[in-house]
């Protein structure tokens, strides 16, 4: 997260750590007791290591009651997630059990009704990704509120020229983002889950190069079809 | 497929009013910016500005802030361009051009005559 | 305005030739995203103009492998490899990266 700042811990009890080898990934948000929402383009990254993910986190290195590792038993990326586009990012991780549920670990309601987030409202997101241009990654949850952006802006040459569909929701950039490791992660605007943080290899900090992020509601149907 | 139709060609007396229409398919309207470039009889192309279709909210170049209007109708997926006041010199053909990926969609054009 | 100047304005070749364009802009087209929105379109007589390469070198989707654009800062070249009679029109240099956007007056490429 560019331009942020620390989060209260575990005041985001959703909040996941998608981790490969031990090492902090991408983010993710609990969606269900056994599900874990992230981005597709994460499995890319994670090449043949061990997939894991950490719930009740606020620090990746300190130990905490809260924090539990849990192991993958099923990834689900989305069917038409394809390497060279941004198109249809998410991954569904079945946890190997049902996450031990508390004030620190609580899966978070995402939107189901398929409408957009009106511009100009602000929206949370979170994450453990970098802090600085230089690549800094820090040890405790960062968060940063940002404002939607409408899509016919978010799509003019300058900015994403044209590569943002309706499936797709975009949040202004200019020096707060989102950025890499962030990927997966939540944004949430009044309480509910609304979008994810795609993963591609975009320019953060850039006003001119807003965040993108996948609607949720967008693939309400796929996401039940998998939790079933 | 994406298209955009334009309304078809106008004569118009100095001091009149016209308002040509861009109607658009093929994709959801309010997700792309809507451009109107001028052509002058025998001329080069000319950036007049855009509208957003999703704000509604327009912009202008310098040369056509005053007399020129855009609009929309974001039900019908139609943009619109207005002007008032008619001088000789905006005897042109006026082209509505789709955002993204660069100006990759154009209207066919709309030839506008001004004539005493 | 970032003025946008071609040359020549009018090309006359024959078929099977090879053509080269050349736009010069009057301010560095760079944006500060890194990327330089320079662009080109074709405009066959009666239609509107069609885009043909974007961001200084990419075809655009549909566009034959003839077509080639190159150049930085200020100084930009299309090449058509082997002109074919489809190819006849004007070719306008197209500057994204500064408000106002703008155009090049235009090359016409003619047979001889």
């Known amino acids: 997260i560019l331009g942020g700042r620390e989060a209260e811990a575990h005041a985001r009890p959703y909040m996941a750590s998608v981790q490969v080898n031990g090492e902090h990934l991408c983010g993710g948000v609990l969606v269900a007791e056994q599900w874990v929402l992230s981005a597709a383009h994460c499995l890319e990254d994670a090449a043949d290591g061990k997939v894991q993910v950490l719930l009740g986190a606020h620090s990746l290195s300190q130990p905490e009651p809260s924090k539990r590792l849990y192991d993958v038993l099923r990834a689900v990326p989305h069917p038409d997630s394809r390497p060279d586009t941004i198109d249809h990012d998410l991954l569904l991780l079945q946890l190997s059990e049902k996450a031990t549920l508390g004030p620190a670990v609580r899966p978070l309601p995402w939107q189901r009704v398929d409408r957009d987030v009106e511009p100009g409202t602000l929206c949370d997101v979170a994450g453990w990704g970098i802090v600085s241009h230089a690549g800094r990654r820090p040890d405790r949850l960062q968060h940063v509120l940002l404002p939607v952006l409408d899509r016919a802006t978010c799509n003019r040459r300058t900015h994403h020229d044209g590569a943002i569909t309706q499936r797709m929701m975009c949040a202004e950039s200019n020096r707060r983002d989102s950025c890499k490791g962030d990927s997966g992660g939540p944004l949430v605007c009044g309480g509910v889950l609304e979008g994810v943080v795609t993963s591609g290899s975009r320019v953060c900090g850039n006003r001119k190069k807003p965040g993108i992020y996948t609607r949720v509601a967008s693939y309400a149907a796929w996401i039940d079809s998998v939790l079933a | 497929q994406i298209q955009l139709v334009q309304s078809g060609p106008e004569l118009k007396k100095p001091g009149e009013t016209v308002k040509i229409s861009c109607k658009a398919s093929?994709?959801?309207?309010?997700?792309?910016?809507m451009n109107w470039v001028k052509q002058g009889p025998g001329k080069g192309l000319k950036w007049m500005g855009w509208?957003?279709?999703?704000?509604?909210?327009?912009t202008y170049a310098d040369d056509f802030k005053g007399r020129f209007a855009f609009s929309l109708e974001t039900s019908a997926s139609t943009a619109y361009l207005q002007i008032s006041n008619l001088k000789n010199e905006d005897t042109a053909t006026y082209f509505c051009?789709?955002?993204?990926?660069?100006?990759?969609?154009w209207g066919q054009g709309t030839l506008v005559t001004v004539s005493a | 305005d970032v003025l946008m100047t071609q040359t020549p304005l009018s090309l006359p070749v024959s078929l099977g030739d090879q053509a080269s364009i050349s736009c010069r802009s009057s301010?560095?087209?760079?944006?500060?995203?890194?990327?330089?929105?320079l662009e080109w379109y074709l405009q066959k007589p009666g239609q509107s103009p069609k885009l043909l390469i974007y961001?200084?070198?990419n075809r655009f989707s549909g566009v034959p492998d003839r077509f080639s654009g190159s150049g930085s800062g200020t100084d930009f070249t299309l090449k058509i490899s082997r002109v074919e009679a489809d190819d006849l029109g004007v070719y306008y240099c197209?500057?994204?990266?500064?408000?106002?956007?703008?155009f090049g007056a235009g090359t016409n490429l003619e047979l001889k």
């Open positions: 093929g994709y959801i309207f309010r997700n792309y910016g």
């Open positions: 197209f500057q994204g990266s500064h408000v106002p956007v703008t």
């Open positions: 051009v789709r955002d993204g990926p660069g100006f990759a969609y």
């Open positions: 509208i957003n279709t999703y704000t509604g909210e327009p």
């Open positions: 961001k200084v070198s």
């Open positions: 301010l560095i087209i760079e944006h500060s995203d890194g990327n330089t929105y």
